[in-house]
Interface confidence: low
């Protein structure tokens, strides 16, 4: 048992919809006999249904939980003593305890239940940024960008939509782009504009609302 060791964080916290990398090193006895390849799997603790089905595995023949398929990835190579786990599109119901299991046919089968990983998925607390380049001048086109710099590149790309109660220059109430191009009118001054960002991988939406400050160039006539 002393030769079986796993070094990984005891606890990891990630916000829903985001990603987390869990560094992990795994050690097991080096048996001189010619054996099959070392495969590893992360499993969820205490799940009565399909307890033997991992959430991520390096064995292509092994079943994985469909709920975590494509989101939980065993990044490391257990043959190189690397059991690093990557989680994308984290969901609230991913919260729980996980343990690593190593298999080397036909002799080695070991579950590292003494070194379990506690995963906490918390509510998404971050909000998008709405970036306005310079000032909004009536009658002049402008690009507004909705940005989520805290989102991870490996996750499912978020979808963007814009909503406004009274933007006269918006042909429809929503647009599916992170960039909104419009030409503000004097009557748009004070209008509220909202960017909604949906992380479909986790089923969560966050938003940011701003109030438009539309200025007139000197010499522009008031209506």
């Amino acid at each position: 048992d002393l030769e079986f060791q796993l070094v990984a964080p005891e606890s990891v916290t990630v916000e829903e919809g985001l990603c987390v990398h869990v560094p992990c090193s795994v050690f097991y006895p080096s048996i001189k006999l010619t054996l099959g390849p070392v495969t590893g799997s992360w499993l969820r603790k205490g799940v009565s249904l399909h307890e033997d089905s991992p959430v991520a595995t390096s064995d292509p023949r092994q079943l994985v939980q469909k709920a975590t398929q494509g989101r939980f990835q065993l990044l490391g190579d257990p043959q190189k003593h690397d059991c690093s786990l990557f989680i994308r599109d984290a969901q609230k119901n991913d919260t729980g305890m996980y343990f690593f299991r190593v298999v080397r046919e036909p002799f080695v089968r070991y579950s590292y239940k003494k070194s379990q990983l506690s995963l906490h998925v918390t509510s998404l607390s971050r909000t998008p940024d709405i970036i306005i380049p310079g000032t909004l001048e009536a009658g002049y086109p402008s690009n507004l960008t909705c940005s989520v710099p805290w989102a991870c590149e490996q996750g499912t790309p978020p979808t963007f939509s814009w909503m406004s109660t009274a933007l006269t220059s918006l042909s429809s109430r929503t647009t599916d782009s992170s960039v909104l191009t419009f030409t503000p009118q004097p009557q748009d001054h004070g209008t509220k504009l909202t960017c909604l960002v949906t992380f479909s991988g986790a089923g969560v939406t966050v938003e940011r609302t701003i109030q438009l400050n539309v200025t007139r160039k000197s010499g522009q006539m008031r209506e």
């Epitope: 399909h50 994985v64 469909k66 709920a67 494509g70």
Partner: nanobody
Framework: EVQLVESGGGLVQPGGSLRLSCAAS???????AAWYRQAPGKQRELVAS???????NYADRVAGRFTISRDNAKNSLYLQMNSLRAEDTAVYYC???????????????WGQGTMVTVSS
């Protein structure tokens, strides 16, 4: 090894009723379950589905006539078919979804099928 045993098919007159059953052995846990049917020379089509919590979905052609139900404790699936029509004649299959994937493909368990013939 998970095995599905379907029963309840047979010959019935138009307007009659049948109750199909599908029992799963092998201790699998089922998340979603569904009934499909395949008429001679046609593609297999979804008849009705039910989630673990009991939410149901029906094909337009059978809505109001068929009722899908399940017994989670017995790992069994049922289809109550009323007001049967000639066009309901088909082989009926149950499909269980244990929420697993193999090689990144969803894994489903299918029954062997039970024949339903609606004829006068």
């Amino acid at each position: 090894e998970v095995q599905l045993v379907e029963s309840g098919g047979g010959l019935v007159q138009p307007g009659g009723s049948l109750r199909l059953s599908c029992a799963a052995s092998g201790g699998t846990f089922v998340i979603n379950a569904a009934w499909y049917r395949q008429a001679p020379g046609k593609q297999r089509e979804l008849v009705a589905s039910i989630s673990y919590g009991g939410s149901t979905n029906y094909a337009d052609r059978v809505a109001g006539r068929f009722t899908i139900s399940r017994d989670n404790a017995k790992n069994s699936l049922y289809l109550q078919m009323n007001s049967l029509r000639a066009e309901d004649t088909a082989v009926y299959y149950c499909r269980l979804d244990p929420g697993l994937a193999l090689n990144n493909r969803p894994l489903y368990y299918w029954g062997q099928g039970t024949m339903v013939t609606v004829s006068s």
